[in-house]
Interface confidence: medium
Amino acid sequence: TLNSVLNSNAIKNLPPPLGGAAGHPGSAVSAAPGILYPGGNKYQTIDNYQPYPCAEDEECGTDEYCASPTRGGDAGVQICLACRKRRKRCMRHAMCCPGNYCKNGICVSSDQNNFRGEIEETITESFGNDHSTLDGYSRRTTLSSKMYHSKGQEGSVCLRSSDCATGLCCARHFWSKICKPVLKEGQVCTKHRRKGSHGLEIFQRCYCGEGLSCRIQKDHHQASNSSRLHTCQRH
């Protein structure tokens, strides 16, 4: 199955150009041909890059959206695709790169006074609008852009994993994205589930550390699907 690509999710200390996919180490990252991609859990060149399967945009990195790789392709087979830059054609906001949105089928620059990204709307629906506004306007983040003078420590807000110190990744938590520790052996990890299971992943974990993969906990095989725990285990 497509999910077999996700059998292992160990990536360690992504360099800044590759650090944008919070909690999604298998995500493709737009780059020039030949650059290393974090695909299939090991650094690979674009030639043998394995696409990251997805069911919805939220499973992809900040600079990606979820769609069938071929025009009019099988909707059941979707992967994370690079976002579309300004003036490129689009069908929904999530297709456009951060700082842009889809207007009349074209990606245009966000007017920060009247546009909020899809994810903000979704989170507002999930949690109710309790005298709340949701900060930030770029897609899939509830953070306004900031200059980071030092690497974020555990718990500090971030935009991408490269904002975080070594051993941490940038992952959604509550209504924000913060630096969280890369997971160690035995720690609970998250398997990406298909649509129809629990709702939007408001809370994300980092991926499992090097040499570890996210697998179902052995003593939970008898538990119902919805309550099964996955933990980081040695390959």
């Epitope: 949690f127 306004s144 718990g155 500090s156 509550f174 924000s176 809370f203």
Partner: antibody, heavy 116, light 112 residues
Framework: QVQLVESGGGLVQPGGSLRLSCAAS????????MSWVRQAPGKGLEWVSV????????YYADSVKGRFTISRDNSKNTLYLQMNSLRAEDTAVYYC?????????WGQGTLVTVSS | DIALTQPASVSGSPGQSITISCTGT?????????VSWYQQHPGKAPKLMIY???NRPSGVSNRFSGSKSGNTASLTISGLQAEDEADYYC???????????FGGGTKLTVLG
């Protein structure tokens, strides 16, 4: 080290108002979400409110919605809780907590007593 | 409005292991694999002991461990010590209006 110090608690009559402050030090205050959590005497913990790092997002527990307002001043490294229309059931120790990976650091608390 | 259910008290002798349970619903604890545990000594502020079900913050003894199955989470303290005597609270996230929910707390008594 991370330090959170609450102040502003005291005795207030029902219907009255009070403003709590929480002075933060030892970390980059402007990079963290912050919360208020309260604990009635002899009772358990109850989450009250949370505010985003840049103040643009705020959430409240149903029990205080419309009466309490959370705010912060990042230039002063201070978190606030404005409490209006206070009720007897608001009597509690109020803690400010850094909302990093869950409530990873807490202040020592300040007691608010609502009584006539 | 206590959303998560904990036993009011548990006890154990020094050196023993004890487990504190925390039961919720599919709308909170069962729906998210995000459970935290806090220790609170009398007159003191709570201290984060476990987050994300079974992760220990730095500085917390490895005698403390967490787990979860279905709608129930557990905190296990092994090699019980006198200083472990305190109140313990579980916490989870929840869908709906209440964003953060706590358990009612469990008083741990270390005998002897």
């Amino acid at each position: 080290q991370v330090q959170l110090v609450e102040s502003g608690g005291g005795l207030v009559q029902p219907g009255g108002s009070l403003r709590l402050s929480c002075a933060a030090s030892g970390f980059t205050f402007s990079s963290y979400w912050m919360s208020w959590v309260r604990q009635a005497p002899g009772k358990g913990l109850e989450w009250v409110s949370v505010i985003s790092s840049d103040s643009s997002s705020t959430y409240y527990a149903d029990s205080v919605k419309g009466r309490f307002t959370i705010s912060r001043d990042n230039s002063k490294n201070t978190l606030y809780l404005q409490m209006n229309s206070l009720r007897a059931e608001d009597t509690a120790v109020y803690y400010c907590a850094r909302h990093g990976i869950d409530f990873d650091h807490w202040g020592q608390g300040t007691l608010v007593t609502v009584s006539s | 409005d206590i959303a998560l259910t904990q036993p009011a008290s548990v006890s154990g002798s020094p050196g023993q292991s004890i487990t504190i349970s925390c039961t919720g619903t599919s709308s909170d604890l069962g729906g998210y694999n995000y459970v935290s545990w806090y220790q609170q000594h009398p007159g003191k502020a709570p201290k984060l002991m476990i987050y994300d079900v079974n992760n220990r913050p730095s500085g917390v003894s490895n005698r403390f461990s967490g787990s979860k199955s279905g709608n129930t989470a557990s905190l296990t303290i092994s090699g019980l010590q006198a200083e472990d005597e305190a109140d313990y609270y579980c916490q989870s996230y929840a869908s709906g209006n209440t964003k953060v929910v706590f358990g009612g707390g469990t008083k741990l008594t270390v005998l002897g």
